[in-house]
């Protein structure tokens, strides 16, 4: 039975040109994490495999850094980076757990004035 839950940073905002950490945390299970995928709906950004280590997709190599931990750091953000990001935890024996983060990349001046994007 799958008892675990994924906690994520939820809906977050960052400013254009800056960086952001995408973070998920799996709790309430003793299952062993064998791999974590970081994905957008139609492309894979990175994989952290327990045996093989990190793999960053070539199209993101310049702007994505592994970590901290099982998280992912996005750098040199552009407005086009706005959207959904998914962490997919592969575990044994439970199976897969998934979490969602929505990132809004704001123009610098907007971000400076403390605006924050929230999905109701």
């Amino acid at each position: 039975m799958m008892t675990g839950t994924i906690e994520t940073t939820g809906n977050i905002s960052a400013e254009k040109g800056g960086s952001i950490i995408l973070q998920c945390h799996l709790s309430s299970t003793t299952a062993q994490v064998t791999q974590v995928n970081w994905e957008q709906q139609d492309q894979l950004l990175a994989i952290c495999n327990a045996d093989l280590g990190w793999h960053i997709s070539p199209s993101f190599k310049d702007r994505v850094a592994p970590g901290p931990g099982l998280g992912l750091t996005l750098q040199s953000l552009t407005v086009n980076d706005t959207g959904e990001y998914f962490c997919i935890y592969h575990t044994y024996p439970d199976g897969t757990y998934t979490g969602r983060i929505f990132l809004e990349v704001l123009e610098s001046s907007v971000a400076e004035h403390g605006a924050r994007f929230q999905i109701p």
């Epitope: 139609d42 492309q43 994989i47 093989l52 793999h55 997709s57 998914f86």
Partner: antibody, heavy 121, light 107 residues
């Protein structure tokens, strides 16, 4: 339990269009992406495209862009794939499929039974 | 597009055999490969995802391995009900692409 039930076989003339339906049940339709894949007689599998039924957002295989249109009707939990300007090479079994997880990777855990489309003059 | 190549279109086997079906990706796809089984007149059935993760309800005689560009599906104790076509698929990038399939036949 999760079920994807597709419409029946179709026979079409070259140049015509076909619209295949895929009715989903047993889960929250808007929460999971629906993919379309085809298989020509005796051949492998070919991915056509995907729809997010919640937002209506789509992504297509470049090969089918402009000819394939994928839509979803939330009120009936049904996804559709329309293919226009049919040619004989489009003769195939068309499948709808669903990813295994709500936000999961693009591996397909649930499949419709397939719809045979025959294009013949 | 990423090309998935299954070099053996047909493989002959016997009940009880250990069978290995291979698949090669045209570029590094890390561990983003799934395997499907398809019997005549049926829809494909998911066996393995992310190279080595067995899907729910799949018998443990089916094992996936590999990373990068080379992947293998192994059936450790071939059963008559395993006779089918087997396809690999990359779930690394769009468009999703499949191998041409490997058909298992009885010797």
């Amino acid at each position: 339990q999760v079920q994807l039930v597709q419409s029946g076989a179709e026979v079409k003339k070259p140049g015509a269009s076909v619209k295949v339906s895929c009715k989903a049940s047993g889960y929250a339709f808007t929460n999971y992406l629906i993919e379309w894949v085809r298989q020509a007689p005796g051949q492998g599998l070919e991915w056509i495209g995907v729809i997010n039924p919640g937002s209506g957002g789509t992504n297509y295989n470049e090969k089918f862009k402009g000819r394939a249109t994928i839509t979803a009707d939330k009120s009936t939990s049904t996804a559709y794939m329309e293919l226009s300007s049919l040619r004989s090479e489009d003769t195939a079994v068309y499948f709808c499929a669903r990813r295994g997880d709500k936000y999961g990777s693009a591996w397909f855990a649930y499949w419709g039974q397939g719809t045979t489309v025959t294009v013949s003059s | 597009d990423i090309v998935m190549t299954q070099s053996q279109r047909f493989m002959s086997t016997t009940v009880g055999d250990r069978v290995s079906i291979t698949c090669k990706a045209s570029q590094d796809v890390s561990t983003a490969v799934a395997w499907y089984q398809q019997k005549p007149g049926q829809s494909p059935k998911l066996l393995i995802y992310s190279a080595s993760n067995r899907y729910t309800g799949v018998p443990d005689r089916f094992t996936g391995s590999g990373s990068g560009t080379d992947f293998t599906l192994t059936i450790s104790n071939m059963q008559s009900e395993d006779l089918a076509d087997f396809f690999c698929q990359q779930h690394y990038s769009s468009p999703r692409t499949f191998g041409g399939g490997t058909k298992l036949e009885i010797k």
